[in-house]
């Protein structure tokens, strides 16, 4: 498939108003199509000309003014001004504000808790498999395999700290060299960025919100992928990370430090440990080829145990097998020796839901995965709704200005670096880059933070998570101190190198442009977001893993042609946009390729067919839930939970609305799709009573 979803130089039909046609329209929209259908915000809504309701590519008659979809939306304050309120109104408003704040903090708390449970769920579902990935002996010689194992394991356990700690324990016990561990750490860095991408998927309901949220989340992915793309070959060639970190570790005489402060865990643990508790040592034991661990459950049953170290007499084949000559004897027939054994006595069971169910890990994991995703989704929707109702008018202006404004000239360039420090600091406080970037995602979605500002915050988050790892390393026991510290420093310098590559010079901030491009595509073809997630975090790593197992010859045999084709396509794309005259007429656009190779439209038709039926059912159910919610929150009109439901409702209410023919799509060019020339926002009613 060509690098962009739609390629070609055909011009859009000037007489039709398409989603994606943001250029100046030759004619104004037909007023007869417009109705003054209003929602509770009393704002007029432009009537949408609809495709069949199940399609993910809705066509919108846009107003004539050109709107940049990446411009932050103006959050209109529809409420009564403070000065116009009476005393009762002011008191009511104050308590409403307090209530909203409490609700926001509550939902934020459960949001973070659900992320923790999500991680536990992933560990239960794929933890053992993840551990087995590590026991592959080829990691030593194949950095590419190490990289994809790092990605896969971190995706499976939803925690880079878990995969990093496995690597540390393997290095400490000489099962892995630091050199072999570095690509795994790079992979773990990539894998950890899936969490906020999953969180972004929860905002799929609103196109413009989803565009921003998804781009904001994937800027992290692209930064990590691009960093690896450049730095892995550099590391393989020069071993600079290994050398620098080795020098640092050897030049300092570190004393064991204290554990990194668990600031957020202190608040969330009391709740999450009531849901499930895991014995994470099992994954490490599997990684270290412990056969007994393969049959152990990850669900912790006993929380209070008494470990008694005792010496027992055991028989040995000969005196050579004795622990020591002085601890060797015979009973006249067999030789005996004394062996130190640790006897574990279970005292008290853990206090969590699954302690007495004795369900297999997969079952517990699946239950928790579904529940945590539901809670995550619910909390996210509520956070967005509350923030949406709070961040309006003056409040929104102040917040947006504070976050997104640069320092005055000549210190404007410092703003980004301050954002990096803020990101690092915040991540250090919450002890998790996933939590920080996931909390950032809805804020980007609703337009409080720009992607340009979110980018340095995310980079800072990457640094923050490594400083946590360094502190944790300093708290390691003597034997693991050196290896854990060196690996934590490798992680740190990898991220620093990445920042130096993709941040200081604005021209090099490729991750932002790539994320925006993906945001545009995903806003138009929402299924593409899921497709992206599967491809980049599962299929590509699994393919490389499989090919690596088949041997380096197979890997090179398949990899080289693929890489060659990608480079060829990128070069061709560059020439087409920069100097097309150099190319022969046929290669000046992608029209020589069949439609399915240069456009997502045919694929969209296929996906729509599959999801259509499901979407209809889903939306009906969704609408019922929304109406129930609206009755509870006493809304004057019914809330709509997502764009698809809105489309359905409008299709049912306005039967007279003509449906645009699918042919309308045929000539949309890639340039428009990639540049985000899609409507700035979808009409969306808001439940102000919240």
């Amino acid at each position: 498939m060509a690098p962009w979803p739609e390629l070609g130089d055909a011009q859009p039909n000037p007489d039709k108003y398409l989603e994606g046609a943001a250029g100046q329209q030759p004619t104004a929209p037909d007023k007869s199509k417009e109705t003054n259908k209003t929602d509770n915000t009393e704002a007029p809504v432009t009537k949408i000309e609809l495709l069949p309701s199940y399609s993910t590519a809705t066509l919108i008659d846009e107003p004539t003014e050109v709107d940049d979809p990446w411009n932050l939306p103006t959050l209109q304050d529809s409420g009564i001004k403070w000065s116009e309120r009476d005393t009762k109104g002011k008191i009511l408003c104050f308590f409403q504000g307090i209530g909203r704040l409490i609700l926001l903090l509550g939902f934020l708390y459960f949001f973070v808790c659900s992320l923790d449970i999500l991680s536990s769920a992933f560990q239960l579902v794929g933890g053992k498999m993840a551990g087995q990935f590590f026991s592959n002996s080829s990691i030593m010689s194949n950095p590419l395999l190490g990289l994809v194992i790092g990605v896969l394991v971190t995706v499976l356990v939803q925690s880079s700290s878990t995969s990093t700690s496995i690597v540390v324990s393997m290095v400490s016990s000489s099962l892995l060299t630091v050199r072999a561990a570095i690509p795994i750490i790079m992979g773990a860095n990539i894998g950890t960025s899936i969490t906020n991408t999953i969180v972004a998927l929860m905002q799929v309901g609103d196109r413009s919100e989803f565009r921003r949220a998804f781009a904001g989340a994937t800027v992290h992915d692209f930064f990590n992928w691009l960093s690896v793309l450049v730095l892995l070959p550099v590391e393989v060639a020069t071993h600079y990370l290994e050398i620098i970190t080795q020098l640092i570790v050897e030049s300092f005489h570190f004393k064991n430090g204290e554990d990194a402060p668990d600031l957020l865990k202190v608040i969330t643990k009391p709740f999450t440990k009531l849901i499930v508790q895991l014995d994470k040592k099992v994954i490490s034991q599997i990684a270290m080829n412990d056969e007994k661990a393969k049959n152990k459950s990850l669900v912790k049953i006993w929380c209070k145990t008494f470990t008694n170290k005792t010496q027992i007499n055991v028989t040995v084949p000969s005196t050579a097998n004795c622990t020591s000559p002085s601890l060797c004897w015979t009973d006249g027939i067999q030789n005996w020796t004394m062996k130190n054994v640790t006897y574990k006595e279970n005292i008290a069971k853990c206090q969590h839901i699954f302690v007495n169910f004795h369900l297999p890990d997969l079952a517990v994991g699946t239950i928790l995965l579904i529940l945590s995703l539901l809670v995550l989704c619910g909390c996210l929707i509520m956070i967005v709704k509350i923030l949406g109702s709070v961040l309006k008018g003056q409040v929104a202006t102040v917040i947006k200005k504070t976050i997104n404004t640069d320092f005055p000239f000549p210190f404007a360039w410092l703003t980004g670096y301050l954002a990096i420090l803020v990101g690092a600091g915040m991540t250090f406080i919450v002890q998790s880059s996933s939590v920080f970037t996931s909390a950032l995602t809805p804020l980007i979605g609703i337009g409080v933070i720009t992607i340009e500002r979110a980018y340095p915050l995310t980079l800072g988050s990457n640094i923050g998570t490594t400083t946590t790892a360094i502190l944790a390393a300093l708290a390691s026991p003597g034997n693991a101190l050196r290896s854990s510290l060196q690996i934590a420093l490798c992680h740190f310098f990898f991220n620093i190198s990445g920042i130096l590559l993709w941040y200081p010079i604005p021209f090099t901030r490729l991750p932002i442009r790539m994320a925006k491009g993906l945001g545009n595509i995903s806003a138009k073809y929402r299924w593409f977001a899921v497709f992206y997630l599967i491809i980049f975090f599962f299929l590509i790593p699994l393919t490389v893993f499989g090919l690596s197992l088949a041997g380096w010859r197979v890997l090179v045999g398949v990899g080289v042609p693929v890489v060659f084709i990608i480079i060829l396509v990128l070069c061709l794309r560059l020439l087409q946009s920069r100097c097309p005259r150099v190319l022969p007429k046929k290669l000046q656009n992608w029209n020589f390729l069949p439609l399915w190779m240069r456009s997502l439209k045919p694929w969209d038709a296929v996906v729509s067919k599959f999801t259509g039926c499901f979407q209809m059912r889903c939306c009906c159910c969704c609408r019922v839930c929304c109406r129930a919610c609206c009755l509870l929150c006493d809304c004057p009109k019914c809330c709509r939970c997502s764009k698809c439901c809105e489309d359905l409702e409008e299709a049912q209410e306005g039967q007279d609305v003509p449906v645009k023919a699918p042919e309308t799509f045929d000539n949309i060019t890639i340039s428009r799709e990639a540049q985000g020339e899609v409507p700035a926002s979808d009409s969306k009613t808001e439940c102000t009573a919240l």
């Epitope: 004897w329 009973d331 027939i333 005996w336």
Partner: antibody
Framework: QVQLVQSGAEVVKPGASVKMSCKTS????????MHWVKQAPGQGLEWIGA????????AYNQKFKGRATLTADKSTSTAYMELSSLRSEATAVYYC????????????WGQGTSVTVSS | DIQMTQSPSFLSASVGDRVTITCKAS??????VAWYQQKPGKSPKLLIY???TRHSGVPDRFSGSGSGTEFIFTISSVQPEDFATYFC?????????FGAGTKLEIK
Amino acid sequence: QVQLVQSGAEVVKPGASVKMSCKTSGYTFTTNNMHWVKQAPGQGLEWIGAIYPGSGATAYNQKFKGRATLTADKSTSTAYMELSSLRSEATAVYYCARGMYGHGAMDYWGQGTSVTVSS
Amino acid sequence: DIQMTQSPSFLSASVGDRVTITCKASQDVGTAVAWYQQKPGKSPKLLIYWATTRHSGVPDRFSGSGSGTEFIFTISSVQPEDFATYFCQQYSSNPLTFGAGTKLEIK
């Protein structure tokens, strides 16, 4: 209580064989080793060998290998020792002793069987 | 084979005396040493095992010490019934071997 009762005294001619028994009671016969010890008149103690009745596994002192055979009958909880090609030096008291589980100390001893080799 | 050298061969003592018997192993036997008491015409009786552990029913005037190659057996206060022959035994490796014995006589 644990008891080890040995067969009576034997007088045999040189070159002949003798088989003595050690009947046990008061414990599970198959869990402990049974040792055999020789004590020549006015001499010290000399270990002949041991048998583990549970499996029939045996171990011998090289000095006695080939001339002493240890067996055990689980059904009667009795251990046996057969001494063959007897010479005058074989004149001694032979004790059976129960080995303590897991090591070579002998906690209970039989009363001994006196064997006299004389022409 | 491991040789156990017991000394003295004969020992005279009076009732109430403290007596010690030494046993030396030709190589390290750890603590795999037992001590036995044998009265004339009787079978041996286990007193001490693992060099220091008293067997059940053995009076606490009997004690053992040592490890490696040198072991000491002590009767803190000799009683009339204690006059007998005492043997040490190693069970560090096969064949099990005994000391020549120490005869404790009334002075």
